[in-house]
Each structure stands twice: as C-alpha cells, then as structure tokens.
C-alpha cells in the first residue's frame, strides 16, 4: 500500500495529527524534499553571521560572515576573524609577523621567508611581513654540481612567531 505521506511535496509535512494530510511548514521552518513527517527549523544567521539567502518553505537560510570575518566549514558553519596581510590571528588578536616571517593572506599564519642560499641562490628582493623574498640567480661561487637535486619544498629557516 502506498504511504499517503509520499504525496506531500517539499514545503509541507505529513501531519499525523490531521489524518496524515499535507500541512504547510510553519513559519521559520522548511522541508526541502517531499514525504517529510516534520519540517526542519530554519538556520538563523546571528552574531558574526549574516544572511546570504532567506529561509523559504522549501530551502534553508544560508549565512556568510560579516565583514572582517571569513567562513570556515561546510555551508559557512564557522566565522573566523580576518587580520591584515603581514599579520596572524592569535588569542590576543592580530599580531604582526615577526622578522623573517610573512603572511600574504588576510587569514592563516606567518611562515618563514625562503632561505635562498640553501638552494644555492641569492636574494634578489628582500622579504617583508607581507611578501616572501625573491630568490635570484645562483650566488657567486656556487657550482650546479654541488647540488644536483632541487629540494621539492622551499628551504626555510625556522621562524619565530608571536605568542
């Protein structure tokens, strides 16, 4: 025998209290598929979240982060504070990258400048808090024969990050 609830379209639910007739989802709830016995509560975009798409009877609300924050997680389930380039986020707030480290994003952490000399190269452009160094041609006295294999990752000196 066919389940009478299977006839209930998205935006409704199969109401057991009313002989399994299809009732519209109450305000602030939705059902995105047919045949549902309950409607789901709409997501509320509060605090650092802001509404990107309003909830409707057939689809949930969608949130993103308020300016100064960026999304993390599926469907922007988390918001994390932005910093400026050249900074990283600590529990005490945004801190400048320490000398010898950089961050070219508004999120994430500082990482050490590339050590050009470990690759047999010289520094062409100095690094800053926002940018890595640019390595130039091989330094004088460096013979390609001394290092035939280029490391797969940039060689770095360990940096020191703010607490």
């Amino acid at each position: 025998l066919q389940d009478p609830c299977s006839n209930c379209p998205a935006g409704t639910f199969c109401d057991n209290n009313r002989n399994q007739i299809c009732s519209p989802c109450p305000p602030n709830s939705f059902s995105s598929a047919g045949g549902q016995r309950t409607c789901d509560i709409c997501r509320q975009c509060k605090g650092v979240f802001r509404t990107r798409k309003e909830c409707s009877s057939t689809s949930n609300a969608e949130c993103d982060c308020t300016p100064g924050f960026h999304c993390l997680g599926a469907g922007c389930s988390m918001c994390e504070q932005d910093c400026k380039q050249g900074q990283e986020l600590t529990k005490k707030g945004c801190k400048d990258c320490c000398f010898g480290t950089f961050n070219d994003q508004k999120r994430g952490i500082c990482r050490p400048w590339t050590n050009c000399s470990l690759d047999g190269k010289s520094v062409l452009v100095n690094g800053t808090k926002e940018r890595d160094v640019v390595c130039g041609p091989a330094s004088a006295g460096f013979s390609p024969g001394t290092s035939s294999v280029t490391p797969p990752a940039p060689a770095r000196e360990p940096g020191h990050s703010p607490q």
């Epitope: 993390l72 997680g73 599926a74 389930s77 988390m78 994390e80 600590t90 529990k91 994003q105 994430g108 952490i109 990482r111 050490p112 590339t114 890595d132 797969p152 990752a153 940039p154 770095r156 990050s161 703010p162 607490q163």
Partner: antibody, heavy 116, light 109 residues
Framework: QVQLVQSGAEVKKPGESLKISCKGS????????ISWVRQMPGKGLEWMGK????????NYSPSFQGQVTISADKSISTAYLQWSSLKASDTAMYYC?????????WGQGTLVTVSS | DIELTQPPSVSVAPGQTARISCSGD??????AHWYQQKPGQAPVVVIY???NRPSGIPERFSGSNSGNTATLTISGTQAEDEADYYC???????????FGGGTKLTVLG
C-alpha cells in the same frame, strides 16, 4: 562544495615505501594549509605536520620529523604523505584535514596496513 | 611542546550534563578546539576558539577555556552524543597542533 578525497587503502610489507594522496576541490587549494593526522587502531588523533601548498612550506610535529615526508603539487590540488621505509607500527588510519588550528574539512581517511 | 591531558572516559545518564576536561600548561593562553568522532567516521568540530559553536551543532554543546583547563560541556546529553571527543590547540611555539588523548563519552541506559 569543498571536498578532500584521499587515496585508497594500502597493504604493505615492512621496509617498503609508500605515498598516499589527498586531493582538494571546491576551494583555492594553494592558499589553505593541509595537515596530516594519524590514528592508530583503537587510539587517539596525532597531528603529524602541515604544508602550505602555495609554496610547499612544511612543518612537522617533533614526533614525526624525519619519519615521513609531506609534499604537495598545487597544479593538481593534491597533498601527499610518504614513507621511505614502512614499519609495522605505521599501521593506522591517516587523515588529511584543511587548516592548521581549526580543521574544518577532513578527508575520508586512508587505512595503511603494514604486515609481513 | 604543550601536552593536553583528557580523562579516558566519562559516563553520563541521558538528560544529564557531561563535562570533559582538557588540561595543559596555560592552555587558556591559546585557543582550544573540540572535535567529536564517531566510529568509522572522520572527526567533526563541535566547539572552536574556546566557546564558539559551528552552525548545525546543537546548543547543548558549549565550551570554556582559562588557566590550565579547557572544558567541553554537553547539557541534556542525548544518546547520539556518545562518541570520542578530542581537544586540540595550535601553539605558536614550534608552530604545531597538539591533540589531547581523547575521551570516550558513554551515555548510560
């Protein structure tokens, strides 16, 4: 949508080498850290190390430094974890995860079994 | 590196409050994050940056962090909360992430 898809389960013998992969999609792979996490059978999570795919800068947990190598190929949005000589004690589930502190997306895990 | 210590197991009756501690030297100076892991699944964030709850995580989950202890609290625990829970922190000394040893939460009955 964001996804991290890991390579399939591996069965290896002690002393063999292995490279497992983690392919990212649905986001700017180059600009987010990828971490690797080990979970031995019936045990807890252990952070192994991380890589910034944009320039392949890596850093490792002291416990895993010299034991494994983390690498990435940003042109195909893939991070790797490799061993040059496996031991029976490397038997574990290995997860890749996006991030360095908050791990917001995880791969499905790669089960590595090392047995003679 | 900082070491994070969690009780191996915590048991709670349905509807009661479960508290899982995570101890480490001055962990209150860093952000603590909490992950839930169910058998055969990858971990999921339930609390991030000490006390923030991702959308989709029930309101009964909350967190705090000060001094040497971070705490995950589950109020009105339900059977579906039975899982392993891990705390973690990122330390700017050594640039490393550390996980606690994990706590198995058992919901009785």
């Amino acid at each position: 949508q964001v996804q991290l898809v890991q390579s399939g389960a591996e069965v290896k013998k002690p002393g063999e080498s292995l490279k497992i992969s983690c392919k990212g999609s649905g986001y700017s792979f180059s600009t987010y850290w990828i971490s690797w996490v080990r979970q031995m059978p019936g045990k807890g999570l252990e952070w192994m190390g991380k890589i910034y795919p944009g320039d392949s800068y890596t850093n490792y947990s002291p416990s895993f430094q010299g034991q494994v190598t983390i690498s990435a190929d940003k042109s195909i949005s893939t991070a790797y974890l490799q061993w040059s000589s496996l031991k029976a004690s490397d038997t574990a589930m290995y997860y890749c995860a996006r991030g360095y502190g908050i791990f917001d997306y995880w791969g499905q895990g790669t089960l590595v079994t090392v047995s003679s | 590196d900082i070491e994070l210590t969690q009780p191996p197991s915590v048991s709670v009756a349905p509807g009661q409050t479960a508290r899982i501690s995570c101890s480490g030297d001055n962990i209150g100076d860093q952000y603590a994050h909490w992950y839930q892991q169910k058998p055969g699944q990858a971990p999921v964030v339930v609390i991030y940056q000490d006390k923030n709850r991702p959308s989709g995580i029930p309101e009964r989950f909350s967190g705090s962090n000060s001094g040497n202890t971070a705490t995950l609290t589950i109020s009105g625990t339900q059977a579906e909360d039975e899982a392993d829970y891990y705390c973690s922190t990122y330390t700017f000394v050594g640039f490393t992430t550390v996980f606690g040893g994990g706590t198995k939460l058992t919901v009785l009955g």
